[in-house]
């Protein structure tokens, strides 16, 4: 999916009002310096591409974050503010339901959510100096 035509300001507002708090709740008890930055993004569409990938694609050691509160709110925000996003996700959602396993918060998932926090921060940050 090409995130170029999303309403970035509306997505930013959704992040600031709820998603950020849900991410903090998920990471509670974890030091902010515990994980190094291993993923970045270079513009808002790129950030959303990486956020979608980390949030909804199963990875080794972290089978699924998709049922977490922050993930469901992320999905809702993208569905509302990114034209045509919902249609592209129907098949992926059906496949995910079949794969669903019991919820376990592993260290790998914590690391992945830490990376998500970094991506969201980059998505929201203004470029302080244009240089």
């Amino acid at each position: 999916y090409d995130f170029t035509n999303c309403d970035f300001e509306k997505i930013k507002a959704a992040y600031l009002s709820t998603i950020s708090k849900d991410l903090i709740t998920y990471m509670s008890g974890t030091k902010s310096t515990e994980f190094n930055n291993t993923v970045s993004c270079s513009n808002r569409p790129h950030c959303l591409t990486e956020i979608q990938s980390l949030t909804f694609n199963p990875t080794a050691g972290c089978a699924s974050l998709a049922k977490e509160m922050f993930a469901m709110k992320t999905k809702a925000a993208l569905a509302i503010w990114c034209p045509g996003y919902s249609e592209t996700q129907i098949n992926a959602t059906q496949a995910m339901k079949k794969r669903r396993k019991r919820k376990v918060t592993t260290n790998k998932c914590l690391e992945q959510v830490s990376q998500l926090q970094g991506l969201w921060r980059r998505f929201n940050r203004p470029l302080l100096k244009q240089q």
Epitope: S40, S42, N43, Q131
Partner: antibody, heavy 122, light 108 residues
Amino acid sequence: QMQLVESGGGVVQPGRSLRLSCAASGFTFRTYGMHWVRQAPGKGLEWVAVISYSGSYIHYADSVKGRFTITRDNSKNTLNLQMNSLRAEDTAVYYCTRSPQWEEVYEALDIWGQGTMVTVSS
Amino acid sequence: SYVLTQPPSVSVAPGQTARITCGGNNIGSFSVHWYQQKPGQAPVLVVYDDSDRPSWIPERFSGSNSGNTATLTISRGEAGDEADYYCQVWSSTSRHVVFGGGTKLTVL
């Protein structure tokens, strides 16, 4: 463990070519801008070239423009530097390094390889 | 092209504060990054975006930037701080990374 490992350095005659490679591991390579920086013996750091995270944008130092070519293969997590028409003044340790980028601004060079030595001599 | 000017050398007594400057035309409008390089080793990022510090760098390292001068401050200097220090910016005008000439810090 985030790591950058350079290879391909060696001794080469003036006018000849050499290809440097940099293998990245421990981070999502395709999301970072990648640079080559060199350091001549006893001298300071000199930036050589940068390639954007997607490979769409490339910039070179004036001293190497037209002779060096930077490329990346995101499927293999590798960065390359093709060096043609080498000169004695290209003799240096060549470092591969990464930086986050935002639009067309490259941020701090936060991870560096250990470097590979290139000697141009007849 | 944009030029960054550093003093070739700076000395500090153990336990005292060292300040390394980096001069450039209106450098305050740039994000300045600082690197430490010990002999035979690759550079290491010690301060980024003027004053932020990677998590693995001690709080003794700090930075500031305004006007035509950026400054790296190393408080409570130690023998292990002896190294070359480089400032760096990205110039969007020339689309180049620019390094200062480097400053050799000696802990007396």
